[in-house]
């Protein structure tokens, strides 16, 4: 039976009814409810919230709502033995200690169980030594230090500013450079916007504010002790020495008041250029060690955190599809927070809650979606995307056969300037068409579409007149669905106008000051941006679950494949002599991309013209669309990253948050001029080109006529 037969109202009316039911006032109320106490993963408070959400989703009308639990490795500070950093004099006396906690915001002084700032999964240790300032601790920062400035970080404690890249990459880079410890701090240059006051008077980071966060390098593994398999009752667990992605050196985060005290004494080399200088009143000398009078003083870290296997809980709600119940569209976002989670994650969880309520209202009126919609409240995202990954590992066989799409729903806002979307190219047309139908919430765009304000404020860098849609990277719960399983995925949120700080978050990210009041007073008093995000996320889910033909356009993959092939070829052509010497050719890849383009166009023609009343044909065409993303998965995974299996996209090896195209080829080419064995290095480039070529060609074949 067709989609419209599955309901008592026409499909167009369904979508309007669904969107009209979404209310800003409800999102506001839900956000307030979710942010009154901390909901740290593995705690009783977060278990209670899981049960509350389960109960409310049932009330809203979902067919079933279950809790699924896993026992995963988490990390906590030692309550009786706090973490801190000191400056010690030649006698070993502590002459300065960093603060043990963030001053709580007004009204929250008596809240218990606020976890002090820490770097989750840091090993214990008390290293002491000279300090080296390493800027953002990016790959290029260490290249600058080691290759240009000839500064050796071996045996040193490094201090790095947060921002630009995922903190786990910073720690990995420091480890590889031989550091014995890492201090992470928030520089005002990255976390204090000019002309804005500190919290509670504005949305800027106060000097005592600190960003928490995990420092793992999991590369998609999930629970460090059970990579590839769910962390259930009968799971085999690795020993800690074999655990995936754990850092080997102590790490600790601090605020800029404390950072000032460490950085102001720095001596040694001057910073190489202005890009290494933040906005503290310090010289930003690189070191190693302190200057002149202070040269005998050292820095000492005191880290006593423990890692322990702890139970976590996901909430999984189901709204059964009327026509294709075995096809799943998933809307998921996490529930666990570092402290109150005013933005991350509860601004997203509140939107999911309202989307569930609206779908529930339609169901109570007799409507059902064509396909099954699964709603998820993930646990332990902050500890390495653990809840979503374990659930996907447990259900991988079902997901790879039945998963149509995954829409992520973490923080709804990271600013209030314009829309930000990252998604598979299959969803480009869906996103563009949907945003053309939605009203912009932006001032100065009254009566205009969201598409219009988005295009104006965030234009595509290569396609003028269109808005920017970015590649999916990682650092959020879509990772396992997209990068490991090859399920078409997307995410949307409202963002800031801060192009220069592309991967530096909003100032109060992961601090105690991320409260309900932060959102209600400074970011979205009318909750109109939250409502818009609910409409985008909900609208995408609605279309994906209810349209007769899946709203995927394979021609858009052809466009980006050409662009990515051009890009990687241009990178390779920086080495024309070696390309000649080692007979490196991209001809096969360009040929495969051309074949994909041709077959995708032919498929689109058939899609337009086939008999949509024939259920077998319809299912066949939809399956070709659903399985296209899956066709880009290499079962062997990327080199040394077996859980990143998508050949077209992977998280950057240098920044987990960013997406890289043709990552296998990109990584093989990266810094190739420094490789010891150029013949082997260029051989790997050729191998990666052949894998990419095969994958693109194989994906194209899945779109060919089946017989």
């Amino acid at each position: 039976k067709s989609s419209s037969e599955a309901t008592n109202i026409t499909p167009k009316h369904n979508m309007k009814a669904f969107l009209d039911e979404l209310k800003a006032e409800n999102i506001k109320k839900f956000l307030h409810n979710f942010t009154q106490i901390p909901h740290l993963a593995g705690t009783e408070q977060n278990f209670q919230l899981a049960k509350q959400i389960q109960s409310q989703w049932k009330e809203f009308g979902l067919d079933s709502v279950e809790l699924t639990h896993y026992d995963v490795l988490l990390s906590y500070p030692n309550k009786t033995h706090p973490n801190y950093i000191s400056i010690i004099n030649e006698d070993g006396n502590e002459i300065f200690n960093t603060s043990l906690f963030e001053p709580p915001p007004a009204g929250y002084e008596n809240v218990s169980d606020i976890v002090p700032p820490f770097s989750a999964f840091s090993p214990q240790g008390m290293p002491e030594g000279d300090l080296v300032y390493v800027n953002y601790a990016r790959t290029e920062d260490f290249f600058k230090l080691e290759r240009d400035m000839k500064i050796n970080c071996s045996g040193k404690i490094v201090i790095a500013r947060y921002g630009k890249v995922f903190r786990g990459n910073k720690v990995k880079n420091a480890q590889l450079a031989g550091a014995t410890g890492v201090i992470l701090y928030s520089d005002p240059d990255d976390y204090f916007a000019p002309g804005v006051k500190s919290y509670p008077d504005g949305w800027n980071l106060p000097g005592g504010g600190v960003q928490r966060g995990n420092i793992l390098n999991l590369n998609g593994a999930g629970d460090p002790l059970t990579p590839g398999y769910p962390a259930n009752e009968y799971a085999y667990r690795r020993g800690m020495a074999e655990a995936v992605g754990l850092p080997s050196i102590p790490v600790h985060p601090i605020g800029y008041y404390d950072a000032q005290k460490l950085l102001e004494k720095m001596g040694g080399s001057a910073s190489p250029d202005s890009s290494w200088r933040g906005s503290l009143k310090v010289p930003y000398n690189v070191g190693p060690g302190f200057t002149g009078n202070f040269s005998t003083q050292k820095v000492k870290m005191h880290i006593h955190s423990t890692s322990e296997v702890t139970r976590i809980y996901n909430v999984i709600g189901t709204l059964r599809g009327a026509v294709e119940p075995d096809r799943y569209v998933i809307l998921g976002g996490h529930r666990d927070s570092w402290v109150f989670g005013g933005i991350d994650p509860q601004s997203g969880a509140a939107v999911v809650h309202e989307i569930v309520r609206s779908f529930g209202m339609l169901k109570k009126e007799g409507w059902r979606p064509r396909r099954t919609i699964l709603f998820a409240s993930w646990d332990a995202e902050e500890f390495g995307l653990l809840g979503s990954t374990e659930w996907a590992e447990e259900n991988s066989r079902l997901l790879q056969e039945r998963g149509v799409a995954y829409i992520n729903a973490d923080s709804s806002i990271e600013g209030n300037y314009t829309l930000r979307v990252d998604c598979t190219p299959l969803m480009y047309s869906l996103v563009y068409n949907l945003t053309k139908e939605l009203e912009s919430p932006d001032e100065g765009f009254e009566g205009k579409s969201l598409y219009e304000s988005w295009t104006k404020k965030s234009p595509s860098p290569e396609f003028s007149g269109m808005p920017r849609i970015s590649k999916l990277g990682s650092g959020n719960d879509f990772e396992v669905f997209f990068q490991r399983l090859g399920i078409a995925s997307g995410r949307a949120r409202y963002t800031k106008n801060w192009e220069t700080n592309k991967f530096s978050s909003y100032p109060l990210y992961h601090s105690v000051y991320e409260t309900y009041e932060l959102v209600e007073k400074f970011y979205d008093p009318m909750f109109k941006y939250h409502l818009t995000v609910a409409q985008v996320r909900g609208g995408m889910v609605f279309e994906l679950a209810n349209s007769v033909v899946l709203p995927f356009d394979c021609r858009d993959y052809a466009v980006v494949l050409r662009k990515y092939a051009d890009k990687i070829y241009n990178i390779s052509m920086k080495h024309p002599q070696e390309m000649k010497t080692y007979s490196v050719s991209f001809d096969s890849l360009f040929s495969a991309v051309k074949n994909f383009t041709e077959i995708a166009s032919k498929f689109s023609e058939r899609l337009r013209d086939f008999d949509k009343s024939n259920p077998i044909l319809l299912r066949m065409m939809n399956d070709q669309l659903m399985f296209l993303e899956r066709a880009f998965i290499d079962p062997l995974g990327l080199p040394d990253r077996p859980f990143y299996r998508h050949v077209i996209y992977a998280p950057s090896s240098h920044n987990k948050y960013a997406g890289e195209s043709f990552p296998g080829i990109y990584d093989a080419l990266f810094d190739i001029e420094s490789k010891v064995d150029p013949s082997q290095a260029w051989g790997e480039v050729k191998r990666q080109i052949s894998i990419a070529t095969f994958t693109v060609q194989a994906a194209a074949e899945t779109l060919s006529e089946v017989a």
Partner: antibody, heavy 121, light 111 residues
């Protein structure tokens, strides 16, 4: 049989605007990249702009970037070229061309008859 | 200023063979497919060769294409008076993200 018919050309003053249209028939318009190619009097062919199949990603030659806008209406099987801030050197016969492969430009297997645009005061 | 270079003109007697070269770089001809177009006087261009060496239906096998490295060649054998026209090579340029045409070559049939 594929047919491409351009319209909207004519005489315009420097700094003025013009909108060219190209109506297509005989193939599934939405699946193919479409291009505009121009030829100044007595000169060679110059590719101006293309738009992909699918959602319609635009591409432009550096000479027209920021002044010309390509668009398509798949429901009307029509390709457009909005030309603003026209200059004397934009004077040419403008051809509409269909790609022979699919969603991005590879080669042009069908061409319109061309339309003359004259920019002069 | 075209990034693909062709000779301005070539000529030969009827029945003879002519070749037209098209020289580019690694970012265009080097890694992309070359096509050739014929433009008879006063008419729109017509596709002659695509994918370096393939002929659309209706194009006689007197016309052939080849590509080597960063250059492409169009060959016309058994030259006829009806072959008098301008010929253009064209390809995608991966660095410019743009389509590029050659400077064009005028073929004259002598006598």
């Amino acid at each position: 049989e594929v047919q491409l018919v351009e319209s909207g050309g004519g005489l315009v003053q420097p700094g003025g605007s013009l909108r060219l249209s190209c109506t297509a028939s005989g193939f599934i318009f939405s699946s193919y990249a479409m291009s505009w190619v121009r030829q100044a009097p007595g000169k060679g062919l110059e590719w101006v702009s293309a738009i992909s199949g699918g959602y319609g990603a635009p591409y432009y030659a550096d000479t027209v970037k920021g002044r010309f806008t390509i668009s398509r209406d798949n429901s009307k099987n029509t390709l457009y070229l909005q030309m603003n801030s026209l200059r004397a050197e934009d004077t040419a016969v403008y051809y509409c061309a269909k790609d022979g492969v699919g969603a991005t430009p590879y080669y042009f297997d069908d061409w319109g008859q061309g339309i003359l645009v004259t920019v002069s005061s | 200023q075209s990034v693909l270079t062709q000779p301005p003109s070539v000529s030969a007697a009827p029945g003879q063979k002519v070749t037209i070269s098209c020289s580019g770089s690694s970012s265009n001809i080097g890694n992309n497919y070359v096509s050739w177009y014929q433009q008879l006087p006063g008419t729109a261009p017509k596709l002659l060769i695509f994918d370096n060496n393939k002929r659309p239906s209706g194009i006689p096998d007197r016309f052939s294409g080849s590509k080597s490295g960063t250059s492409a060649t169009l060959g016309i054998t058994g030259l006829q008076t009806g072959d008098e026209a301008d010929y253009y090579c064209g390809t995608w340029d991966s660095s410019l993200s743009a389509y590029v045409f050659g400077t064009g070559t005028k073929v004259t049939v002598l006598g």
